[in-house]
Interface confidence: medium
């Protein structure tokens, strides 16, 4: 019995759902009563999910797996793994038995994008040319381990005096801290780039240091210049900090987070107490860090509707405020490709190829190209529809006249995540049937 799985690893983002594709070719007269299907972890042989005696036997893997019951009779034995975790990474084997046995293993590669790095300076005031400063670049909750690069304002790599550490949290996600020690010139820009090697996602931040006194008077409130990018469903930290003076106590602090445009209250701290969330009970401060001047806000289970500007107001004796932007994003699924017609194709036939990718944000950019990488722009129609959560489903249709044979690729790009999802189909100019997508 021939069991087919994808050759390449399936890449899944932490917290999203992944489909481990597996298919077999049912013979005429096949009935589900004959099917025995087992999914297991390849290495430990731990049972993940099974189907037997005409019935789905259910998940044996943290109740996070499901089959596609309506597709089993057509030979689709794929497994849906929900709310992917780092610990799920590895090889899964699909065993199919009807009269004969067959099996194949598919690899799951888990990934999580790194947050936009936050940059801190030590010391951070009264800096003069010739002073030695320590610049720390911190990026959070990524997987797998990152590659970190430093460069100056001219793009010249800085390799000396760099120390990088990566620590995994309980979920297996890495927090990266990279420290650069430099001697200040008249002024200078220092950039840190954190790369996710699997997603080919780069997160970067820079700091420009002008060695001179910072103005006194009002409370200086610092937030990141660039938008904070957060994936739908994950938690985001809107960073905000102030410099407490010696003898500062939380009883003196008034902190308010609000939506910049509508001034709607989000969270507040006053009279030495956290006054709690006024924003769908999805916000929290970092109480243990407030006394050190960390007024950051944690926004849980980010939604598309959260996108926008948040203002952090700090009052001790004086007032100060600053606004930080939240950019929400969701990766697009690997495109599925369909052909119409999909049988008995001959050179000269006109076919419609549809490329569909789901549940991304913001709107995608779609590109078509042929097997030689030449862009195909004519006869392309792309539509994008937002669902109730504000996530977009993309459908792009290409009409082509078949040559002797040809490959047609569709690339769906998320402009914020710089994430490319692509699918392709190869059509040979002879009578053929397009295989069903797993």
């Amino acid at each position: 019995l021939e069991v087919q799985v994808p050759e390449d690893p399936v890449v899944a983002l932490v917290g999203t759902d992944a489909t481990l594709c597996c298919s077999f070719s049912p013979e005429p007269g096949f009935s589900l009563a004959q099917l025995n299907l087992i999914w297991q972890l390849t290495d430990t042989k731990q049972l993940v999910h099974s189907f037997a005696e005409g019935q789905d036997q259910g998940s044996a893997y943290a109740n996070r797996t499901a089959l596609f019951p309506d597709l089993l009779a057509q030979g689709n034995a794929s497994l849906r793994l929900q709310r992917v975790r780092v610990a799920d990474e590895g090889s899964f084997t699909c065993f199919v038995s009807i009269r004969d046995f067959g099996s194949a293993a598919v690899s799951l590669q888990v990934a999580a994008p790194y947050s936009k790095p936050s940059m801190t300076l030590e010391p951070n005031k009264d800096l003069r040319p010739g002073d030695t400063v320590t610049i720390t670049c911190s990026s959070y909750q990524g997987y797998p381990e990152a590659e970190v690069f430093w460069q100056d304002g001219q793009g010249v790599p800085l390799t000396g005096n760099v120390t990088t550490s990566q620590m995994a949290n309980e979920q297996g996600l890495f927090d990266v801290h990279s420290i650069l020690r430099v001697v200040l010139g008249a002024n200078g820009t220092y950039s840190c780039l954190v790369r996710n090697p699997v997603l080919q996602q780069d997160a970067h931040s820079s700091v420009t240091i002008t060695p001179q006194r910072s103005p006194t008077g009002a409370v200086e409130v610092q937030v990141p210049e660039d938008p904070v990018v957060a994936l739908v469903g994950t938690d985001a930290t809107l960073r905000c900090s102030f410099s407490p003076e010696p003898g500062f106590s939380l009883a003196q602090l008034n902190l308010i987070w609000q939506l910049t445009d509508t001034k709607q209250l989000v969270h507040s701290f006053t009279e030495g107490r956290d006054q709690g969330s006024a924003y769908a009970n999805r916000t929290a401060l970092f109480p243990d860090l407030l006394a050190q001047g960390n007024a950051s806000l944690r926004l849980q289970r980010v939604r598309v509707a959260d996108e926008g500007s948040f203002t952090c107001f700090v009052s001790i004796r004086d007032f100060g405020s600053a606004a930080v932007s939240l950019q929400v994003a969701a990766p697009y699924s690997k495109p599925s490709m369909t052909l119409e017609p999909n049988k008995d194709l001959r050179p000269g036939d006109t076919v419609t190829i549809t490329c569909s990718s789901y549940r991304g944000y913001p709107e995608a950019e779609v590109f078509w190209q042929d097997g030689q990488g030449v862009p195909l722009t004519g006869n392309v129609t792309t539509s994008q529809m937002a669902n109730e959560q504000g996530l977009f489903d993309v459908h792009s249709v290409l009409r082509v006249v078949l040559g002797a044979n040809g490959t047609y690729s569709c690339l769906v790009r998320n402009p914020v995540l710089q994430q490319d999802a692509h699918g392709s189909v190869t059509i040979t100019g002879q009578p053929m049937t397009f295989p069903p997508e797993a």
């Epitope: 008034n254 308010i256 609000q258 001034k263 009279e271 006054q275 709690g276 107001f313 009052s315 007032f319």
Partner: antibody, heavy 117, light 112 residues
């Protein structure tokens, strides 16, 4: 001594808007939250929402979210509550009340708003 | 929304005698910061409400010590140890743990 002095009584037609003011004195206006509460004739008290004068942060009772607008003028230490699309059920005494986000200690004398055609 | 239920609706009292008003909430009033934001107000005839008790049992400044508050979670009580003629009016309990903040329906205290 803390004082909250509200504007005078208003008579309005259905569908129109009303703007009630509340001038504060005797404390640092910018540092405390201002709440608005109303009381229909012979009825209990109903919380409309609150505003923080310094940041302008607001939090509304969902029941009033689309019709009530809370604002402040820090230069005159005055808070305002505007209610639009008035209907007869909005006939009530409207109070401002100053305090923290989770409480209100001091109340204005109240402003009677009558909605009648 | 949190529903605040007061009893009795009306309370005829004799000066010098004690009085007690009950207030029950439809959900616990313990805030995430562990405080309980339950208050008692008195509205005298023709006046604005005035604060008597905050955070269940704390007397506001200037409030006579004959007024006391108690309770926890969802059940709260206001007691007047010896009623005086000036104590007449409508008493309201109020919660500000959950948005929207809500009030009880009021208890009218009058001299017999």
């Amino acid at each position: 001594e803390v004082q909250l002095v509200q504007s005078g009584a208003e008579v309005k037609k259905p569908g129109s808007s009303v703007k009630v003011s509340c001038k504060a004195s005797g404390y640092t206006f910018s540092s405390y939250w201002m709440h608005w509460v109303r009381q229909a004739p012979g009825q209990g008290l109903e919380w409309i929402g609150l505003i923080h004068p310094w940041s302008g942060s607001t939090n509304y009772n969902e029941m009033f979210k689309n019709r009530a607008t809370l604002t402040v003028d820090r230069s005159t230490s005055t808070a305002y509550m505007e209610l639009s699309s008035l209907r007869s059920e909005d006939t009530a005494v409207y109070y401002c009340a100053g305090g923290g986000r989770l409480y209100f200690d001091y109340w204005g004398q109240g402003t009677t708003v009558t909605v009648s055609s | 929304d949190i529903v605040m239920t007061q009893s009795p609706l009306s309370l005829p009292v004799t000066p010098g005698e004690p009085a007690s008003i009950s207030c029950r909430s439809s959900q616990s009033l313990v805030h995430s910061n562990q405080d309980t934001y339950l208050r008692w107000y008195l509205q005298k005839p023709g006046q604005s409400p005035q604060l008597l008790i905050y955070k269940v049992s704390n007397r506001f400044s200037g409030v006579p010590d004959r007024f006391s508050g108690s309770g926890s979670g969802t059940d709260f009580t206001l007691k007047i140890s010896r009623v005086e003629a000036e104590d007449v009016g409508v008493y309201y309990c109020s919660q500000s743990t959950h948005v929207p903040y809500t009030f009880g329906g009021g208890t009218k205290v009058e001299i017999k």
